[in-house]
């Protein structure tokens, strides 16, 4: 029951983080530019990954998309290749998920291909947290190291006057839902891969085992039969060791002054 | 790197009208705001006029219906056309955009060269 609960657990958790992801790689709010207000209107620039954005205190917000690769940082290249990589490595899992789910039955499946299913999909839905982190927080850094503050100088000519204005990239909310996605998507990845260790088949060797002795000089062997939950390969507890050894199944023991337990 | 280019300028007499021009040009993705600011001889910058993409228009008192701000948005053009001028109406006329040269680059100020106006009989 903890196994089951474990597991659709870290699914749901994961979706979450998943879905949180594609939002973040989708939202054009990745970095916001503080901006004095001009004499006419505020005006708001933020960017993303794909588009640049501008909103007036009006309310008209004009959008451009980035059509060209070239003039592109090759960090944002790098941040975009990432969460493309966290976000199909996530899908993949949720659907490797699905398949390994234990209160989902499908045909025959043994638990132990499920066991296998759920580390393949935790493993990926690690993987995928990691990179949607490493995607958000390489931007952030990029932000702190080449964009935190840039200065415009004016120049005005004949004037010869110089004014400067320092406009401020800060961190977009896009930021923190990637971090946030991120991290529920490694937690869930993590649970997927606890669940896994309780869905394996256990199996134990049990030492003591009724042997029938074929005579008065057959001396006892130690050893056993590897008794099995019922979800193995072992499943009919077939014999194991010859010589005079029998499982519960195969022979039915009498009492006698043989016979060691 | 965005240019901006004014023209229109000259000497005119008083009560009489210009057409002041403003053309962008270079590397542009964006220009949210473009505005008109003179200088006067002896003197500081003064707004006068500005137009966001979005139409959101705004004057100086001291030109308000006399003055009319328009741009062009498909040739990134910023006009001013000036009627009923007056002396004081002299100045260096500066065109400003408050630009981005490419979308991943803050917005920053732009500013043109100059225009000289010239109001005097």
């Known amino acids: 029951m903890a196994v089951t609960a474990c597991q659709g657990l870290g699914f749901v958790v994961s979706l979450i983080g998943i879905a949180g992801i594609i939002a973040a790689t989708c939202m054009d709010q990745w970095s916001t530019q503080d901006l004095y207000n001009n004499p006419v209107t505020a005006v708001f620039n933020y960017q993303g990954l794909w588009r640049s954005c501008v909103r007036e205190s009006s309310g008209f917000t004009e959008c451009r998309g980035y059509f060209t690769l070239l003039g592109l940082p090759a960090m944002l290249q790098a941040v975009r290749a990432l969460m493309i990589v966290g976000i199909v490595l996530g899908a993949i899992g949720l659907l490797v998920s699905i398949f390994a789910l234990k209160c989902i039955r499908i045909g025959s499946m043994e638990d132990s291909a499920k066991a296998n299913m759920t580390l393949t999909s935790g493993i990926m839905f690690i993987v995928s947290g990691l990179c949607a982190i490493a995607g958000v927080s390489v931007f952030a850094n990029m932000l702190v190291t080449n964009f935190w503050m840039s200065t415009a100088n004016m120049y005005t000519g004949m004037g010869g006057m110089v004014q400067t204005v320092q406009t401020r990239y800060t961190f977009g909310a896009a930021l923190f839902v990637g971090w946030v996605a991120g991290g529920l998507t490694l937690i869930g990845g993590v649970m997927m891969c606890i669940a896994c260790r309780g869905l394996a088949p256990e199996e134990t060797n049990y030492k003591a085992v009724s042997y029938h002795a074929s005579g008065h000089s057959v001396a006892y062997k130690p050893g056993g039969f590897k008794a099995s939950t019922g979800f193995g390969s072992n499943t009919k507890n077939k014999k194991i060791y010859d010589g005079g050894a029998r499982t519960e199944d195969e022979v039915q023991s009498y009492p006698s002054k043989h016979d060691y337990v | 790197q965005v240019q901006l280019v004014e023209s229109g300028g000259g000497l005119v007499q008083p009560g009489g009208s210009l057409r002041l021009s403003c053309a962008a040009s270079?590397?542009?993705?964006?220009?949210?705001?473009m505005t008109w600011y003179r200088q006067a001889p002896g003197k500081g910058l003064e707004f006068v006029a500005g137009?966001?993409?979005?139409?959101?228009?705004n004057y100086a008192d001291s030109v308000k219906g006399r003055f009319t701000i328009s741009r062009d948005n498909s040739k990134n053009t910023l006009y001013l056309q000036m009627n009923s001028l007056r002396a004081e109406d002299t100045a260096v006329y500066y065109c400003?955009?408050?630009?981005?040269?490419?979308?991943?680059?803050?917005?920053?100020?732009?500013w043109g060269q100059g225009t000289l106006v010239t109001v005097s009989s």
């Open positions: 270079g590397s542009i993705f964006s220009i949210p705001v």
């Open positions: 137009i966001s993409k979005g139409g959101t228009s």
């Open positions: 400003n955009a408050q630009a981005s040269s490419f979308g991943w680059m803050p917005l920053s100020d732009y």
